[in-house]
Interface confidence: low
Amino acid sequence: EDLKKVFPPKVAVFEPSEAEISHTQKATLVCLATGFYPDHVELSWWVNGKEVHSGVSTDPQPLKEQPALEDSRYSLSSRLRVSATFWHNPRNHFRCQVQFYGLSEDDEWTEDRDKPITQKISAEAWGRADC
Amino acid sequence: PYIQNPDPAVYQLRGSKSNDTSVCLFTDFDSVMNVSQSKDSDVHITDKTVLDMRSMDFKSNGAVAWSNKSDFACTSAFKDSVIPADTFFPSPESSC
């Protein structure tokens, strides 16, 4: 890792599958930090402005995106699982934060979801449909 | 750890940003099940990790697969692992 070759991560949060919510009454958010080098990152989940540890599982170490390359960039994934009712509460705000060299990259689900009519409303009813 | 009532499933997730990454979540599987790495260099699969929902006294195994390939599908994401055929839950179609 020379001083010029430092790549910060791209961070993205993926929302729970409606199928999972219907099937299990639980909701798993996935955070991906990708394309970073070197492999020095710290990932954390924040719910309503507070860091959470319960329901969180993060890869123990980053994954080489191209294992054959000595200087491959890295990726890291993390899951946050909450109850379906907690996920469907539009007041709840979820954020994945990745610290890299002291810089902070993050992605989040904010409070702009419409309040669902029923507990099993589809993601599209929250204004998330790509249309 | 011992997972009570394993209920293995693969779910497709959607990103909050308009990106071309597809993510598949393999979850709630028994601890004896191993997750194999992908033979496709464009498909990334994590090792399994354990998640503990302490407030619900519930633990679950999970692994994540993702790719930027346009033809990447959750039905084939974990094809190198031994997963029952009834494990895959398709995402609901958009009603727009």
């Epitope: 020095h40 710290e42 060299y101 002291g102 | -």
Partner: nanobody
Framework: EVQLVESGGGVVQPGGSLRLSCVAS????????YGWYRQAPGKEREKVAH???????DYADSAKGRFTISRDESKNTVYLQMNSLRPEDTALYYC???????????WGQGTLVTVSS
């Protein structure tokens, strides 16, 4: 705050060996990355070697096969074993640590290595 103190520099003949040490004032589990860098007179600072999560190591081309980076967690110390030293290895050698504690990026004051006959 993390402080890094390097030692082990000195004057050595070509072909000789030196072992540099870098002691961190903070517990090693709070540090995800150690690196050794060097700066020769009139040149830019350059990477020599680093060791990071999972004890993965990486070396500059000029260090491969001659230098070895390692760490001893019980002593909060990272080492750079330098063998087959050459005159062009003469430089001020710096230790670097990336920490979980603000401000994250720490450098030592450096230890001078001179390779001369």
């Amino acid at each position: 705050e993390v402080q890094l103190v390097e030692s082990g520099g000195g004057v050595v003949q070509p072909g000789g060996s030196l072992r540099l040490s870098c002691v961190a004032s903070w517990e090693v589990h709070q540090i995800n990355f150690y690196g050794w860098y060097r700066q020769a007179p009139g040149k830019e600072r350059e990477k020599v070697a680093h060791i990071s999560i999972g004890d993965q190591t990486d070396y500059a081309d000029s260090a491969k096969g001659r230098f070895t980076i390692s760490r001893d967690e019980s002593k909060n110390t990272v080492y750079l074993q330098m063998n087959s030293l050459r005159p062009e290895d003469t430089a001020l050698y710096y230790c670097r640590a990336l920490s979980r504690i603000w401000p994250y990026d720490y450098w030592g004051q450096g230890t001078l290595v001179t390779v001369s006959s």
